[in-house]
Amino acid sequence: MEDFNMESDSFEDFWKGEDLSNYSYSSTLPPFLLDAAPCEPESLEINK
């Protein structure tokens, strides 16, 4: 485990999968687990 490394201001979710993750690396996502207000659109609820 290491501290967050700000090499870029744009991030993609690791686990959501190519068809569900933000493939364009939108910079609206905050660094992982930091105290930032999430700015993502309403999440897709997959399960019925």
Partner: antibody, heavy 120, light 116 residues
């Protein structure tokens, strides 16, 4: 320094349920999905599903539909995975994991694992 | 037939280069997928090494040395993890994974033994 810290080992009877917790230590739950992955003794990893900590939205693997429930409590930075109607073949180490990628690098975070033993 | 097939075991000497393969089931084109590679040592969770789809779409795990690299073999419909300059600490189980049909699918794993 961010860590995912899981609850301790459990021994359960067939037919019962288990609830495993995963706490973000050194940070708060963000909008990145938290996946749950299990690994039976001597077997490869098996993905169970993920939860979006921000919205609570879930995506469960078909195999576990109807038997697994993933929730989160953002006030205490903790995600939960509950598996019901346990069978002996549910005996495994259960991991939570999360992470994100930039254009050139990925950062993954895993809990230490929780051993769940199902035995009569 | 499994979605992802890996050889169960492989052994090589220190300093050698080894290629670990992850063959996708017929009808699933390797060129359409990011192939994820993990290393796992006894008693520890899997550790992400890298993911590879093409030379323009590849990401290394944080802190993972460059001697771990990815490629693909289109003719064999397989993803490849290349480990160069093999070290004793590389002895571990290696798993590939893909996001397929809205689920993460893992291969059965390859147990890599470093001789000597």
């Amino acid at each position: 320094q961010v860590q995912l810290v899981q609850s301790g080992a459990e021994v359960k009877k067939p037919g019962s349920s288990v609830k495993v917790s995963c706490k973000a230590s050194g940070g708060t739950l963000s909008s990145y999905a938290i996946s749950w992955v299990r690994q039976a003794p001597g077997q490869g990893p098996e993905w169970m599903g993920w939860i979006n900590p921000n919205s609570g939205g879930t995506n469960y693997a078909q195999k576990f539909q109807g038997r697994v429930t993933m929730t989160r409590d953002t006030s205490i930075s903790t995600a939960y995975m509950e598996l019901s109607r346990l069978r002996p073949d549910d005996t495994a180490v259960y991991y939570c994991a999360s992470g994100y990628c930039s254009r050139t690098r990925c950062y993954d975070y895993w809990g230490q694992g929780t051993l769940v033993t199902v035995s009569s | 037939q499994a979605v992802l097939t890996q050889p169960s075991s492989l052994s090589a000497s220190p300093g050698a280069s080894v290629s670990l393969t992850c063959t996708l089931r017929s009808g699933i084109n390797v060129g359409a997928y990011r192939i994820y590679w993990y290393q796992q040592k006894p008693g520890s969770p899997p550790q992400f090494l890298l993911r590879y789809k093409s030379d323009s779409d590849k990401q290394q795990g944080s802190g993972v040395p460059s001697r771990f690299s990815g490629s693909r073999d289109a003719s064999a419909n397989a993803g490849i993890l290349l480990i160069s300059g093999l070290r004793s600490e590389d002895e571990a189980d290696y798993y590939c994974a893909i996001w397929h049909s809205s689920a993460w699918v893992f291969g059965g794993g390859t147990q890599l033994t470093v001789l000597g």
